[in-house]
Structures are given as structure tokens and as C-alpha cells.
């Protein structure tokens, strides 16, 4: 009796959904009452399917209303765990254990990332010095550095602060400001750069013709 997995690594975005699968040998018909399915993550019990039904009493509270075993897939020999509204804390090594005549288990790794996609931007001007303050802010995971560039590809020196998000403990709130003398219609870019390939998110900031005081906000 051998369980197989088509993927042993799943990468999912924060807030998205994921379905992890373990396949087990099944005859033309399935006897639900002889099937045992456990899904666990470290010390947290997520699914306990015994005697033809899920025992929700043992489910760890952090997965409540978010994790379910897809029953229709069992008849195809698949123990499919679906997690909705994925959180950063969901990342880790999952174990599916299946008893159906024989018994076996497999491990699957879930990685969760949160791109710095929704970048808020603000442009303000100091009425005394006429210096512009450009600000970009976004939440994501893991930590990112912010690179400021001009339209002629010059790298500029900004100041970045990283705090914890109010939304979720593990999310980072990254804010970066650039103080610069600029003229109307000049274009600047803030790029949130995480480790890994193609993990960059960029916002374009255009200096307006005139700025009211107090500073306006553009999103």
C-alpha cells in the first residue's frame, strides 16, 4: 500500500486557496467506512476522517472554516486537502496519513508568499524648499528592500522603514520615502524587491503640475 504525491511542494499566495493531494490505491468502488485519512501540520490536526465522516472536534482552531477534505475526490483515490484564505502561518510541512487496508504517509511542503503588489503612493511638497517627498508603502512577505530610480535609470537614495503589519502578525509593512528636487511631469519609480527571481513590484510616481497644501494622496 503506497501513497503517491504529484507534487511535494506547493507555493501559494497569501489570501489565496490551495489544494494539496495524496493519492492512494482504490478499487472500482470505495468503502468509506474502511478509509482513514489524517492531515496534520507539525503538531496541528487539520483533518481526521474516520468511519465515513470528518471529526471537526479535533481540528486545530487556526484551520477552522478554512480547511476541508474534498469528499468527492476520495472516490478517485485522492485525499485532497483544500485550504482557503491561506495565511503565512499555514506555511510548513504537512503530513497526509491514509489507512485503507494498508497504511502509508507522505509529507508535502507548503510555502506561502505575499507579493508587495498593492503599492500605495503619495507625493507631497515642502512649500518652503520646494523639495518633493515621494512615499511608497506596501505589505508583503518576506522582507523587501525598496529601490528608487528615475526615468533615466539613475538609482536614487531613499529611506525605508519596516514594521509589522496590523493585518497579520507575520506580514511586513514596508514604507520608503525619497526626498528630491523635481520638476512637473518628472517620473520616478519605487521597486519593492524580495529575494528570488521575478519577485519585484514597481509603482510609477509622476510629479504633478502643482500640489495643493496639505499634500494630496494618490493610490
Amino acid at each position: 500500500f503506497t501513497i503517491t504525491v504529484s507534487k511535494d511542494l506547493y507555493v501559494v499566495e497569501y489570501g489565496g486557496n490551495v489544494t494539496m493531494e495524496c493519492k492512494f490505491p482504490v478499487e472500482k468502488q470505495l468503502n468509506l467506512f474502511a478509509l482513514i485519512v489524517y492531515w496534520e501540520m507539525e503538531d496541528k490536526k487539520i483533518i481526521q476522517f474516520v468511519n465515513g465522516k470528518e471529526d471537526l472536534k479535533v481540528q486545530h482552531s487556526s484551520y477552522s472554516q478554512r480547511a476541508q477534505l474534498l469528499k468527492d475526490q476520495l472516490f478517485l483515490g485522492k485525499a485532497a486537502l483544500q485550504i482557503t484564505d491561506v495565511r503565512l502561518q499555514d506555511a510548513g510541512v504537512y503530513c497526509c496519513l491514509i489507512g485503507y487496508g494498508g497504511a502509508d504517509y507522505k509529507r508535502i511542503t507548503l510555502k506561502v508568499h505575499a507579493p508587495y503588489r498593492n503599492i500605495s503612493q503619495r507625493i507631497s511638497v515642502d512649500p518652503v524648499t520646494s523639495e518633493h517627498e515621494l512615499m511608497c508603502q506596501a505589505e508583503g512577505y518576506p522582507e523587501a528592500e525598496v529601490i528608487w530610480t528615475s526615468s533615466d535609470h539613475r538609482v536614487l537614495s531613499g529611506k525605508t522603514t519596516i514594521t509589522n503589519s496590523n493585518r497579520e502578525e507575520k506580514l511586513f509593512n514596508v514604507t520608503s520615502t525619497l526626498n528630491i528636487n523635481a520638476t512637473a511631469n518628472e517620473i520616478f519609480y519605487c521597486t519593492f524587491q524580495r529575494s528570488g527571481p521575478e519577485e519585484n513590484n514597481t509603482a510609477e510616481l509622476v510629479i504633478p503640475e502643482r500640489l495643493p497644501v496639505p499634500a494630496s494622496e494618490r493610490t
Partner: antibody, heavy 119, light 108 residues
Framework: EVQLVESGGDLVKPAGSLRLSCVAS????????MSWVRQAPEKGLQLVAW????????SYANAVKGRFTISRDNAKNTVYLQMNSLRAEDTAMYYC????????????WGQGTLVTVSS | SYVLTQLPSVSVTLRQTARITCGGD??????VYWYQQKLGQAPVLIIY???SRPSGIPERFSGANSGNTATLTISGALAEDEADYYC???????????FGGGTQLTVL
């Protein structure tokens, strides 16, 4: 090499008890379901009892329900059949068989142990 | 409960084809297994999942299953194939195993 060796068969009086044992070797015992199948003299095969590998799920033939109990000790690589309230019609060769990984079939069988119930 | 019906006996001439049938209600929707049992010996699994052969089982043994009948075919039967043959399926998979009554094959 997979081996299943049964023992415990004997001549016993009606209403008596017997405990059959089957010692397994040559495979990871805790990963397979095990069964007892019997064959009365000059008759066909009948599944007596089944136990799954993992959670101790069991199943019995109607003819033995409430009288026979199947159990396993994964540490000792052994499956047992406790037979109580024996009847003449329980007389048979009792085979221990290994489940074929999540299927209803039996891919390895022991040579059997004979149980005779007679006064 | 589920019933599997086999003919008590079948004869075949040496090196001819023997067909042993196993009848059951909608048996084609279930998996069928076949065992060979020689006199004084334990049964041996020769076909599983309708038509698959375990390693070590000669190619002359084949199986098919559809509708209400499963068939074990022995192409070019040999004297050593003389034995009782049992089909097996289930009412409920795993826990509801059912055997046919057995067919005694005689090789002439």
C-alpha cells in the same frame, strides 16, 4: 521472502475456545491489512475476519460475528483470531492471508492450521 | 449479501484453452480476483484487478470482467494447471469480501 506461519489449531469440543496466531515475516507488517480465511472440508473459501493496517478497523463474516475476534500486535508481527463458542460448522482449515495493499485481494497466504470442533 | 456463481467443474484438453466464469450482479463495476488452489495447498493469487497478473504467474493466465460475468482464461492449459479456481469480489470493498464456490479444472 514473505512468510505467514499459522499455529493454534486443535481438536476442541463444541462451545469451547481457541486462539489462532499468525506470525508474519519478510515485509513491513504494520503497512498491510491481514485476514483469516477458512475452508471447510471439501468446501470453498470463506472470509472469516479482516483487520486493517492502521486504525484497527475490523470486519467479520455474519456466521462468526460476536463469537470471533481478530486483533494484531504490530510489534510482534502477529495477527490473532480468538474463537469462542465454537460450533461443529466452524471445523475448517484456517488460513492467514495478507491484504494486497488497499485491495480486497490476498497476495500471500500461510499454509493453514486445522481447527476441528467435535465432541 | 453479494453472491458469486461458478460452475463446479470444467474440463479442457491438454494445450487447449480453458475458460472459467464467475457470475455476479453488475460484477463489471467491481474488481475481480482469481486464485488457484492445488490439492493440499494454500490458494495462490493469479489475477488481480480483473486482468493483472502478479509477478511469477505465467502469461497463459488472463482475466476479463464486464457486465455480469468475469472470466479466467487459460490459454494452452498444462497438466500442472489442474486445480480448483476461485473468483473473489466484494459487496463492500475490503471489508465485504466474497468468494465464488470454486471451479475444479480437469486437464485431459
Amino acid at each position: 521472502e514473505v512468510q505467514l506461519v499459522e499455529s493454534g489449531g486443535d481438536l476442541v469440543k463444541p462451545a469451547g475456545s481457541l486462539r489462532l496466531s499468525c506470525v508474519a515475516s519478510g515485509f513491513t507488517f504494520s503497512s498491510y491489512s491481514m485476514s483469516w480465511v477458512r475452508q471447510a472440508p471439501e468446501k470453498g473459501l470463506q472470509l472469516v475476519a479482516w483487520i486493517d493496517a492502521y486504525a484497527g478497523v475490523t470486519s467479520y463474516a455474519n456466521a462468526v460475528k460476536g463469537r470471533f475476534t481478530i486483533s494484531r500486535d504490530n510489534a510482534k508481527n502477529t495477527v490473532y483470531l480468538q474463537m469462542n463458542s465454537l460450533r461443529a460448522e466452524d471445523t475448517a482449515m484456517y488460513y492467514c492471508a495478507r491484504g494486497q495493499g488497499g485491495r480486497s485481494s490476498f497476495d500471500y497466504w500461510g499454509q493453514g492450521t486445522l481447527v476441528t470442533v467435535s465432541s | 449479501s453479494y453472491v458469486l456463481t461458478q460452475l463446479p467443474s470444467v474440463s479442457v484438453t491438454l494445450r487447449q484453452t480453458a475458460r472459467i466464469t464467475c457470475g455476479g450482479d453488475s460484477i463489471g463495476s467491481k474488481n475481480v480476483y482469481w486464485y488457484q488452489q492445488k490439492l493440499g495447498q494454500a490458494p495462490v493469487l493469479i489475477i488481480y484487478d480483473d486482468s493483472s497478473r502478479p509477478s511469477g504467474i505465467p502469461e497463459r493466465f488472463s482475466g476479463a470482467n464486464s457486465g455480469n460475468t468475469a472470466t479466467l482464461t487459460i490459454s494452452g492449459a498444462l497438466a500442472e494447471d489442474e486445480a480448483d479456481y476461485y473468483c473473489q469480489s466484494y459487496d463492500i470493498p475490503l471489508t465485504g469480501t466474497v468468494f465464488g464456490g470454486g471451479t475444479q479444472l480437469t486437464v485431459l
